[in-house]
């Protein structure tokens, strides 16, 4: 048993049918000696007196409010979660698996520079009763600072007969250099409670990883004389990270005929400009990707060729 | 049809060319040496991250962009001093900060060629005969130096009299590569920034 | 104490659907994880697929991805494999089992496909 | 096709003492708990041994486990006739986790 907060303590236990549970004595904070009666949650049936209380704890029905009274009067509470080992490996109830880049992938992260921000985002079916936490470090033996906000529900959408919440969060490295070769990874963790139970998710990255850069801005068709061919431009992002003679990116820009089975003409080029045949009813989209360390590709940016 | 990247005028900046050959050789490397030594930990999660520059030079600092310069947390100072006599920027006025970025870049492509060097003696000694040191690679790191034309001693190559362990010197190639990545990724915009000064 | 009954084998010829059923009891069903499990004659374990507590992440084996569904209805204590388009190599004992340290196995249900 | 490897076979005469070995690698063995079973013919399998060396109620002491870096072994000392069976190690990947990985299988024939 530990203390996650003021008041709240995670029970682990290795969970599987008729598991023999743990046994957990809980204290009443009070200088009170006796006269002192234990509750738990709404229940008015007294489960035990004294200042101490010796319970097992096996199922959920053995988790949650614990409240020491003395004639009538509230003296303390003491609030027990779970947190289930399945088969040598903590249970993951509450988040939904994204399954990329492998299984077991609930946190994805993702940065649009280097200035040491990124933002982490999971889902979950469950929509009520559910808290979340997060902190975040770099390197985990002598941690360096990274600041990180509030999670928040960022979007919802119908999955079949689900819904399906997504929770995000913004993190800063408190003393970032874009410049900088990363030698410790990001760590992110996070708390994750529902109901009674608890469970906890962390990541690992290097920022460099988790790079995609925002679309090109700014995409122009200049149409060449007497030519089917168009000069295509744009601009690096305004989020990317400068001097963009430092931080070069890479570009890839595709003609894309109206149906999805025609085919595609693409070209990569490292300047902010390309030359390609517009065809009717075309369009032409531009993406963006570190120009020497392959991470993602951005989102493309798109204009009708009309 | 997918069209070749256009490559910029290598006549411009000797050097920029020779990095990016450098970045695509070390990085074919180093997909070799992941999908070789699949049974051993060489993914970038599995390897302790080691720098052998560290302490010996300071390529980050030393060739830092001027607006990356009022960015205090990229102003960790090492004092360390560097021959400056290099010839890469050809024509060009070569300031002492530029110069001492540059001859930061010789000493870590020095240092990695000993490395490598050292490392593919040992494993030519391998009955396995399971993964060795491309000669592109090598001639690359050389060539890069050679455009970088910095006088220096000469560091030996380092010979080990006990038995080679080659479990652990292919770990420590997948260190040596990851990291001798990272550090061309480096020079590479080292190179680009400088070339559009 | 806990039990687990699998239902629903049978001879079923190639291409077709079948179902199998799962019956839970002497536990908390809908605390649980559960996977299906099955062994061709003369053959050894092969697992197939997993579900964890409400359903909202399931897990299948290459061999059976886009053919079989695994799903639960903890109101009825009850674990589902719904299998289509089952091929030869799909014959063998079915078996239910819960995810922990200490597993507990349902006796199987043989499924044959043959034309 | 399972990347945990077992012998086919081992066999003894009673009284005797017999291992099986299962062979993983670091993304398996290496990195998670193994579990040994015991199935009869024509039952389902019985758990012998889980988190490596750990033995549920009732498992005659007889039946130890351990694990060593990527492999794992199963131990039967003073061996019975009814010890005759095929037995089974377990374990997970740390990139397919959950998924179930089995051993190839051993035949143990207690020798008259």
């Known amino acids: 048993i530990w203390e996650l907060k003021k008041d709240v303590y995670v029970v682990e236990l290795d969970w599987y049918p008729d598991a023999p549970g743990e046994m957990v004595v809980l204290t009443c904070d009070t200088p009170e000696e006796d006269g002192i009666t234990w509750t738990l949650d709404q229940s008015s049936e007294v489960l035990g007196s004294g200042k101490t209380l010796t319970i097992q704890v096996k199922e959920f029905g053995d988790a949650g409010q614990y409240t020491c009274h003395k004639g009538g009067e509230v003296l303390s509470h003491s609030l027990l979660l779970l947190h289930k080992k399945e088969d040598g490996i903590w249970s993951t109830d509450i988040l939904k698996d994204q399954k990329e880049p492998k299984n077991k992938t609930f946190l994805r992260c993702e940065a649009k520079n280097y200035s040491g921000r990124f933002t982490c985002w999971w889902l979950t079916t469950i929509s009520t009763d559910l808290t979340f936490s997060v902190k975040s470090s770099r390197g985990s033996s002598d941690p360096q600072g990274v600041t990180c906000g509030a999670a928040t529900l960022s979007a919802e959408r119908v999955r079949g007969d689900n819904k399906e919440y997504e929770y995000s969060v913004e993190c800063q490295e408190d003393s970032a250099c874009p410049a900088a070769e990363e030698s410790l990874p990001i760590e992110v963790m996070v708390d994750a409670v529902h109901k009674l139970k608890y469970e906890n998710y962390t990541s690992s990255f290097f920022i460099r990883d988790i790079i995609k850069p925002d679309p090109p801005k700014n995409l122009q068709l200049k149409p060449l004389k007497n030519s089917r061919q168009v000069e295509v431009s744009w601009e690096y992002p305004d989020t990317w990270s400068t001097p963009h003679s430092y931080f070069s990116l890479t570009f890839c820009v595709q003609v894309q005929g109206k149906s999805k089975r025609e085919k595609k003409d693409r070209v990569f080029t490292d300047k902010t400009s390309a030359t390609v045949i517009c065809r009717k009813n075309a369009s032409i989209s531009v993406r963006a990707q570190d120009r020497y360390y392959s991470s993602s590709w951005s989102e493309w940016a798109s204009v009708p060729c009309s | 049809r997918n069209l070749p990247v256009a490559t910029p005028d290598p006549g411009m900046f000797p050097c920029l060319h020779h990095s990016q050959n450098l970045l695509r050789a070390v990085s074919n490397m180093l997909q070799k040496a992941r999908q070789t030594l699949e049974f051993y930990p060489c993914t970038s999660e599995e390897i302790d991250h080691e720098d052998i520059t560290k302490d010996k030079t300071s390529t980050v600092e030393a060739c830092l962009p001027l607006e990356l310069t009022k960015n205090e947390s990229c102003l960790n100072s090492r004092e360390t001093s560097f021959i400056t006599n290099g010839s890469c920027l050809a024509s060009r006025k070569t300031s002492f900060m530029m110069a001492l970025c540059l001859s930061s870049i010789y000493e870590d492509l020095k240092m990695y060629q000993v490395e490598f060097k050292t490392m593919n003696a040992k494993l030519l000694m391998d009955p396995k005969r399971q993964i060795f040191l491309d000669q592109n690679m090598l001639a690359v790191i050389d060539e890069l130096m050679q455009a970088l034309n910095f006088n220096s001693e000469t560091v030996p190559q380092k010979s080990s009299l006990e038995e080679p362990d080659f479990y652990k010197t292919k770990i420590k190639l997948c260190i040596l590569l990851h990291a001798f990545r990272i550090r061309a990724v480096t020079i590479d915009r080292v190179m680009s920034y400088l070339n559009a000064s | 104490q806990v039990q687990l009954v699998e239902s629903g084998g049978g001879v079923v010829q190639p291409g077709r659907s079948l179902r199998l059923s799962c019956a839970a009891s002497?536990?908390?069903?809908?605390?649980?994880?559960m996977h299906w499990v099955r062994q061709a004659p003369g053959k050894g374990l092969e697992w197939v697929a997993f579900i964890e507590v409400d359903g909202s992440n399931k897990y299948y084996a290459d061999s059976v991805k886009g053919r079989f569904t695994i799903s639960r209805d903890n109101s009825k204590n009850t674990l589902y494999l719904q299998m289509n388009s089952l091929r030869a190599e799909d014959t063998a004992v079915y078996y239910c089992?819960?995810?922990?340290?200490?597993?507990?196995w349902g006796q199987g249900t043989m499924v044959t496909v043959s034309s | 096709q399972s990347v945990l490897t077992q012998p086919p076979s081992v066999s003894g005469a009673p009284g005797q003492r017999v291992t099986i070995s299962c062979s993983g690698s670091r993304s398996n063995i290496g990195s998670n708990t193994v579990k040994w079973y015991q199935q009869l013919p024509g039952t389902a399998p019985k758990l012998l041994i889980y988190?490596?060396?750990q033995r549920p109620s009732g498992v005659p002491d007889r039946f130890s486990g351990s694990k060593s870096g990527t492999s794992a072994s199963l131990a039967i000392t003073g061996l019975q006739a009814e010890d005759e069976a095929d037995y089974y190690c377990q374990s997970y990947d740390r990139y397919t986790h959950p998924a179930l990985l089995f051993g190839t299988g051993t035949k143990v024939t207690v020798l008259a």
């Open positions: 089992k819960t995810h922990g340290s200490h597993d507990n």
């Open positions: 002497g536990f908390t069903f809908s605390s649980y994880g």
């Open positions: 988190y490596n060396d």
